[in-house]
Interface confidence: low
């Protein structure tokens, strides 16, 4: 006769592990009982349980409540066991030895792996802005046994790298990613990816990038410099910006306060009627967290009385 | 879960201060920003301020220059100091964080009400 087993006998972490361990005799042969035994390496054997044909299972105190036998129907040649609720410690290799009757003994090795899932976890860098060189977007850490591997699934351009640490019975796997901040990178995905052979897809965690940023600022409203003339109702000027944080917008006029009747409201100043006394320096003051910028426009209110060309200047400041 | 309290809401005169309290249950995680939105009877719900970990902060126009927001990150807690209250102000005040976790998870807390009447 001869002994069946496996080679390897892979389980994750916390299922139960069937040792597989059966005898296939010839006609008449019985088996009187099987041990199992762990036998790592310079530890000398540590007997796990034994099955006898007659008085039944026994377990050593150190496996107590946690070695039994398959549920039946059972095959009096089989000596498989299970191994409840594996943890790491139970890695090892264990033999099963069968004595027979009337072949003998027989004895077989198996390696049992338990799989330890990684449980990832993903930090971001540091605030990101505009004009930062190569910067720390987020790093993203997973443990696990065997090690896993962490990936990065982003349309966002940037650089890897990855180091590892092994510990006794496990090792973890930290890869970061770094990136040159940019605007358009505002609401993209950073997904880090972790695979590993104890889970059953991969486990993806998800960061929203948010770049801080302020753009040029700019005054709309003066593109035709005739509808700015005396008596000319709804005129306004708009600044234009765009910024992460949302900006905030402050009106001020250089050369004096702002003329009564003009309306502030958030990035839009609008005038009464035109009279000669809305002719002056304005300044949009764009501001948030990150930056402020100005952008200053004169305007020139027209006397139609008068034959003169309204002058219209745009500067914009940081 | 993070859990947002506020208090000190409550009926102020015009031209009254207030001092608006959030406490977020304590959290593994570091709680990214922390701030305060309202909404009037009738209207949208407005933004108002917000404080960053370092202690940066933004204001909505109408109430920059009157209304200031702060924090104390070693108790997870922001306030909003509101100082020259106006009508326009009454509104259920609303504190909001935002948990950087697996990206940016934002909480609200159930508001409380601030009535500035004479």
């Known amino acids: 006769g001869e002994l069946e087993t496996s080679d390897v006998v892979t389980v994750v972490l916390g299922q139960d592990a069937k040792l597989p361990c059966f005898y296939r005799g010839d006609s008449g042969e019985q088996v009187g009982q099987v041990a199992w035994a762990r036998v790592d390496a310079g530890e000398g054997a540590q007997e796990l349980a034994l099955l006898h044909s007659k008085y039944g299972l026994h377990v050593s105190p150190a496996y107590e409540g946690r070695v039994e036998q398959p549920p039946p129907p059972r095959n009096p040649l089989d000596g498989s066991v299970l191994l409840r609720n594996a943890v790491q410690a139970d890695e090892g290799e264990y033999e099963c030895r069968v004595s027979t009757f009337p072949a003998g003994s027989f004895q077989a090795r198996l390696r049992l792996r338990v799989l330890v899932p990684p449980l990832p976890s993903l930090n971001p860098g540091p605030a990101l802005e505009e004009g930062q060189g190569l910067t720390l977007a987020a790093s993203c850490t997973a443990e696990g046994s065997p090690a896993p591997s962490v990936t990065w699934d982003t349309e966002v351009k940037g650089t890897t790298s990855s180091r590892s640490f092994k510990h006794s019975r496990s090792a973890a796997v930290t890869s970061e990613f770094h990136l040159v901040p940019s605007r358009s990178m505002n609401g993209q995905p950073l997904t880090c990816v972790v695979s590993h052979p104890g889970l059953l897809q991969d486990q993806r965690i998800t960061h929203i990038l948010h770049v801080s940023f302020l753009a040029e600022a700019s005054v709309r409203g003066l593109e035709d410099q005739n509808l700015w003339h005396i008596g000319r109702e709804g005129a306004m000027l708009k600044c234009l910006s765009e910024g992460q944080p949302p900006p905030s917008y402050n009106w001020t006029r250089l050369d004096g306060p702002l003329p009564s009747g003009v309306r502030v409201d958030g990035d839009t100043l609008g005038f009464p009627p035109l009279t000669t006394e809305h002719s002056g320096i304005y300044v949009c003051h764009v501001s948030n967290e990150f930056s402020s910028r100005d952008s200053q426009v004169t305007v020139d209110v027209l006397d139609p009385q008068e034959d003169s060309g309204k002058q219209v200047d745009l500067v914009s400041a940081s | 879960e993070v859990q947002l309290v506020e208090s000190g809401g409550g009926l102020v005169q015009p031209g009254g201060s207030l001092r608006l309290s959030c406490a977020a249950s304590?959290?593994?995680?570091?709680?990214?920003?922390m701030g305060w939105y309202r909404q009037a009877p009738g209207k949208q719900r407005e933004y108002v301020a917000t404080i960053t970990t370092g202690g940066s902060t933004n204001y909505a126009d109408s109430v920059r220059g009157r209304f200031t927001i702060s924090r104390d990150n070693s108790e997870d807690t922001v306030y909003l100091q509101m100082n020259s209250l106006r009508a326009e102000d009454t509104a259920v005040y609303y504190c909001?964080?935002?948990?950087?976790?697996?990206?940016?998870?934002?909480?609200w807390g159930r508001g409380t009400q601030v009535t500035v009447s004479s």
């Open positions: 909001t964080a935002e948990l950087v976790r697996r990206g940016p998870t934002t909480y």
């Open positions: 304590r959290s593994t995680f570091s709680l990214n920003i």
